[in-house]
């Protein structure tokens, strides 16, 4: 045959499916690799073949089609399973071609188990929610083209093991989950259970994400610089180990990049030629605000780094702020035999 | 199509009880809330209370708890609400109301008018 | 006394534009979506607006919602004689325990 376009193994889709449950995949040529649709490719006179690899074998096979109930099928881009079996588990691989083109993906197929509490090895979503806020609502995910618009299914929530049937701050409203107001108390798992008809059978499909209530964009202030502050001064004598941290408080802020870093006379530490170390460390509190820590550390301070200044920095996307460590050489104590003996005019 | 059918007008003496009930066709019965709304003559329309077909939790207005009673019946997908203690000011027409709690109530009963008077 | 306060009326001619204002607070409009309902005389109210600005299939586009802050608004434009009715705000509050709250509606009158 022909040579392939081989794209390879697309590990970046790691698919994971729910055993016994329907589950539609599309093709991932027509979504990241080709620059045109399925239907333009099959206008184009381009057959789409697919066949896959069992787990722990490297041999590749046909799909069988004509299995009782039409169990797998293929409609367009996307490989139907009506529902999963465990023995799915494998490297699935479309293939795009013509006499004269082809291009071909793999990517693997993961058919997981849950239990009767929806717990399983599936890599969960996470939905951050913020707390005290006003309605927030989660849409039950992925569920898309599995029935038409004509059907409709039974959706019920849980969260963990429980179903959500009280009118508390967590409403089931068909396919999303309200949250009136959340508390840190909801955080959690949460799994919509959607149930449809089809061909007379009952189908479902279980989706489950975790939720994580952090700040909110209410309560979100610029970073602030607990330390250095004025109440405390670094007095140091030559040869003595300087340490100043720098510790600051970031609100929690969707998508916002935080920053910590110390300057030395108005440069970064890296272009002043002192022997200066910098040790960071970073604390989340429940609502997943940000306390960084950056200690700079100068194992032997001379007494011309002991003049220098030395600032903290910090940015959010709230703004940007800055705090002058007081640093002062200690005035060596007076030795009594000679200082205070001429102190007190003795000769 | 979606309906919401109410008994019939209802006329009871001051401390009496009464029961609407609201006959649900036209969708899944267990997948939508119901809610009981009132409007006295003249009035806007007053709030009493929320019913879960699913699992039957409730949740009443403050000014109705301990007087109000919302049921339902899967078998024949009907809602029930019963008021209790009657008195001239709950003269009503009483709304059955299918919808979810954050988008709205989008089907309504025809309404039921109860009249208290003695 | 409602908790979300409406006029008590309003009024304007065919073909016009009329708006009708919903105030709340933060504990209800302010953190939540709003809904409006049409009430014509003798029949049930009918939902015009959900989530604040959102109409369900039916609902003209002569319909609209908004929201700013701890108010709401409907729009009605190009007005018509069959727009003659109550309309009520409506939202929630949760403090522990829910409750729906309604305007305590507002009366359009068409002129002419």
């Known amino acids: 045959s022909e040579r392939c376009d081989d794209w390879g193994l697309d590990t970046m889709r790691q698919i994971q499916v729910f055993e016994d449950e329907p589950a539609r995949i599309k093709c991932p040529l027509f979504e990241h690799f080709l620059k045109f649709n399925y239907s333009t490719a099959h206008s184009a006179g381009l057959t789409l073949i697919w066949y896959w690899t069992r787990q722990d074998r490297d041999l590749e096979e046909p799909i069988n089609f004509r299995l009782p109930e039409n169990r797998i099928s293929k409609e367009k881009d996307v490989l139907w399973f009506r529902p999963t079996l465990l023995n799915d588990t494998g490297n699935y691989t479309c293939m795009l071609r013509n006499t004269t083109y082809c291009s071909k993906v793999a990517f693997p197929l993961e058919v997981v188990q849950k239990d009767s509490c929806f717990n399983s090895p599936m890599k969960l979503p996470v939905h951050k929610l913020y707390i005290e806020y006003g309605i927030q609502r989660i849409t039950c995910p992925n569920v898309d083209g599995y029935f038409p618009s004509s059907v409709k299914p039974t959706i019920t929530w849980y969260m963990g093991c429980y179903k959500i049937q009280n009118f508390n701050n967590v409403i089931p409203e068909g396919m999303n989950l309200s949250f009136l107001i959340a508390f840190i108390s909801n955080n959690g798992n949460y799994t919509c259970v959607v149930t449809y008809p089809e061909n007379g059978r009952t189908f479902h499909l279980t989706r489950t994400l975790t939720v994580k209530v952090v700040g909110s964009p209410k309560n979100a202030v610029p970073p602030v610089i607990h330390s250095p502050n004025d109440h405390v001064v670094y007095e140091k004598e030559p040869g003595e180990e300087l340490l100043i941290p720098c510790t600051v408080y970031f609100s929690f802020l969707m998508d916002s990049r935080n920053e910590v870093w110390w300057t030395i006379d108005g440069k970064k530490p890296d272009d002043i030629p002192i022997d200066v170390t910098i040790n960071e460390s970073i604390s989340h509190s429940r609502t997943e605000d940000e306390t960084r820590t950056q200690i700079l550390s100068i194992k032997k301070v001379t007494s011309e780094d002991l003049k220098r200044s030395y600032v903290c920095h910090a940015r959010s996307a709230k703004g940007e702020v800055a705090k002058a460590a007081t640093v002062k050489q200690k005035v060596p104590a007076p030795r009594y035999t000679v200082e205070l003996a001429c102190g007190f005019g003795a000769t | 199509q979606v309906q919401l059918v109410q008994s019939g007008a209802e006329v009871k003496k001051p401390g009496a009880s009464v029961k609407v009930s609201c006959k649900a066709s036209?969708?899944?019965?267990?997948?939508?809330?119901m809610h009981w709304v009132r409007q006295a003559p003249g009035q806007g329309l007053e709030w009493m209370g929320i019913?879960?077909?699913?699992?039957?939790?409730?949740s009443y207005a403050q000014k109705f708890q301990g007087r109000v009673t919302m049921t339902r019946d899967t078998s024949t997908s009907t809602v029930y609400m019963e008021l209790s203690s009657l008195r001239s000011e709950d003269t009503a027409v009483y709304y059955c109301?299918?919808?979810?709690?954050?988008?709205?109530?989008?089907?309504w009963g025809q309404g039921t008018l109860v009249t208290v008077s003695s | 006394q409602s908790v979300l306060t409406q006029p008590p009326s309003v009024s304007a001619a065919p073909g016009q534009k009329v708006t009708i204002s919903c105030s709340g607070s933060?504990?209800?409009?302010?953190?939540?979506?709003v809904s409006w309902y049409q009430q014509l005389p003798g029949t049930a109210p009918k939902l015009l607006i959900y989530?604040?600005?959102k109409r369900p299939s039916g609902i003209p586009d002569r319909f609209s919602g908004s929201k700013s802050g701890t108010s709401a608004t409907l729009g009605i434009t190009g007005l018509q004689t069959e727009d003659e009715a109550d309309y009520y705000c409506?939202?929630?509050?949760?403090?522990?325990?829910?409750?729906?709250?309604f305007g305590g509606g507002t009366k359009l009158t068409v002129l002419g």
């Open positions: 109301a299918r919808g979810f709690v954050t988008s709205g109530i989008d089907y």
């Open positions: 036209g969708y899944t019965f267990t997948s939508y809330y």
């Open positions: 019913i879960n077909p699913s699992g039957g939790s409730t």
């Open positions: 933060s504990s209800n409009i302010g953190n939540n979506y």
């Open positions: 989530d604040n600005n």
């Open positions: 409506q939202t929630w509050t949760y403090t522990g325990r829910l409750w729906i709250v």
